[in-house]
C-alpha cells in the first residue's frame, strides 16, 4: 500500500477552548509533495478517474487518560486515530513485496485530522497536591485530504523516524507518526 496513514494520537495542551479546523492549506508544492525521496514515501499512481470522496479513511476511537508527570486526568478523554486507504487499491501493488510502484505525478491523499476540538480536563495529583485544570486539543474527525505543503512541513515533521526500515519486502518508507508524540502532550502548556 503506498498510502500512508497518520498516527494521530498526540494530545496537546492549547490556550483556548473551541473548534479547530485545519489551518488553511498553502499552495501545493510538487517538489515537496510528490518525490519518493521526500520522507522515503514510495511513488504512486496519480488519481485519474476516481474522486477521493470515493475512498474512506477510518476514525478509530480510543479512550485514554491525560497525564502530566505523576498527575492524571480525573476522567478519560476520547482520542481519534486517523488511518486508512485514501487511494485506489487497484493501482497499488497487488501483494506485499511484489508488484511495482508507479511513477509519482499526482497529488498525494492521506487520511489526516480534519477538525480538532478542545477539552478541559482536571488533573488529579498524588500527595495532596491541588488538582490542575488543563485544556487539551484532540482530533475530532478525520478525512481523506490532499497533502499540502503545510501538512508536509508540520504534520509530517515526525515522519521518517523509521524511514530506513523496509517492511515485508517493500521499498523503504516511513512508518506513520510515532505514538511517542504523546509524550510531549503536556510540554506545550501555555
Amino acid at each position: 500500500q503506498g498510502w500512508q496513514a497518520f498516527k494521530n494520537d498526540a494530545t496537546e495542551i492549547i490556550p483556548e477552548l473551541g473548534e479547530y479546523p485545519e489551518p488553511p492549506p498553502e499552495l501545493e508544492n510538487n517538489k515537496t509533495m510528490n518525490r519518493a525521496e521526500n520522507g522515503g514515501r514510495p511513488p504512486h499512481h496519480p488519481f485519474e478517474t476516481k474522486d477521493v470522496s470515493e475512498y474512506s479513511c477510518r476514525e478509530l476511537h480510543f479512550t485514554r487518560y491525560v497525564t502530566d508527570g505523576p498527575c492524571r486526568s480525573a476522567k478519560p478523554v476520547t482520542e481519534l486515530v486517523c488511518s486508512g486507504q485514501c487511494g485506489p487499491a487497484r493501482l497499488l501493488p497487488n501483494a506485499i513485496g511484489r508488484g511495482k510502484w508507479w511513477r509519482p505525478s499526482g497529488p498525494d491523499f492521506r487520511c489526516i485530522p480534519d477538525r480538532y476540538r478542545a477539552q478541559r480536563v482536571q488533573l488529579l495529583c498524588p500527595g495532596g497536591e491541588a488538582p490542575r485544570a488543563r485544556k487539551v486539543r484532540l482530533v475530532a474527525s478525520c478525512k481523506c485530504k490532499r497533502l499540502t505543503r503545510f501538512h508536509n512541513q508540520s504534520e509530517l515533521k515526525d515522519f521518517g523516524t523509521e524511514a530506513a526500515r523496509p517492511q515485508k519486502g517493500r521499498k523503504p518508507r516511513p512508518r506513520a507518526r510515532s505514538a511517542k508524540a504523546n509524550q510531549a502532550e503536556l510540554e506545550n502548556a501555555y
Epitope: Q1, D9, V81, R175, A179
Partner: antibody, heavy 120, light 107 residues
Framework: QVQLQQSGAELVRPGTSVKVSCKAS????????IEWVKQRPGQGLEWIGA????????NYNERFKGKATLSADKSSSTAYMQLSSLTSDDSAVYFC?????????????WGQGTSVTVSS | DIQMTQTTSSLSASLGDRVTIRCRAS??????LNWYQQKPDGPVKLLIY???TLTSGVPSRFSGSGSGTDYSLTISNLDQEDIATYFC?????????FGSGTKLEIK
Amino acid sequence: QVQLQQSGAELVRPGTSVKVSCKASGYAFTNYFIEWVKQRPGQGLEWIGAINPGSGGTNYNERFKGKATLSADKSSSTAYMQLSSLTSDDSAVYFCAREDYGDVYAMDYWGQGTSVTVSS
Amino acid sequence: DIQMTQTTSSLSASLGDRVTIRCRASQDISNYLNWYQQKPDGPVKLLIYYTSTLTSGVPSRFSGSGSGTDYSLTISNLDQEDIATYFCQQGKTFPFTFGSGTKLEIK
C-alpha cells in the same frame, strides 16, 4: 522478524483473575495497535479490544467491558490483558495480534495463543 | 456493531477445484475486509487484507474481491495445504468483527 510471544497456559479458579502477556519483538512497539481476540473451543474469533501502546488508549468490545482490562508497558514492549471474575464462559484461547494501522489495516501478526481454563 | 456473515460454515471440495468463500457485512465497510486462515489447532494467519491484497508468501492461487457489503475469497486450484478454516473480518470501525468461519474440507 516480527514476533508476538504470549505467556503460557493458565488453569484458574472461578471468581479469580488472570493476566495474559504478549511480548512484542522485531518492530517498533508504539507504532502499531495490539488487539486481543478470544476463541472458544471449536468456535470462531471474537474481538475483545485494542490498545494503542504509544498513548495507552484503549477500545473495548462492549461485551468485554468490565471483564477485560488492556495495558501496555513500552519499556518492555509487552501488552497485557487482565481478565477478572472468571467463569467457565471465559475458558478459551486468547490471542494477541498486531494491527498495522498505517499500511495494512489488518492484524498482520498473531501470537501463538494462551489457553485459559477456568475450573474449580 | 457491524455483523459479518459467512453463510457457509463448511465446504467440501476436491483437490484442484476452484473454491469461493463468501462474506457479507451488515453495512458498507469500504473495502476494509480481511481474510484469515487457521489450520487445526494452529495459529491464525493473515492471508488477504483490504479486500484483495495478498500478504507475503501467500500463494497466488488465493484472491479476494468485493466492495460495499459483499466480499469473497477464491482459491483457484485447491491444494491439500489449504485445508483450514477461513475467517473474514471487517476493519472499518471498532468493534472489529469476524465472520463465523468457513471450514474447508477435502471430498
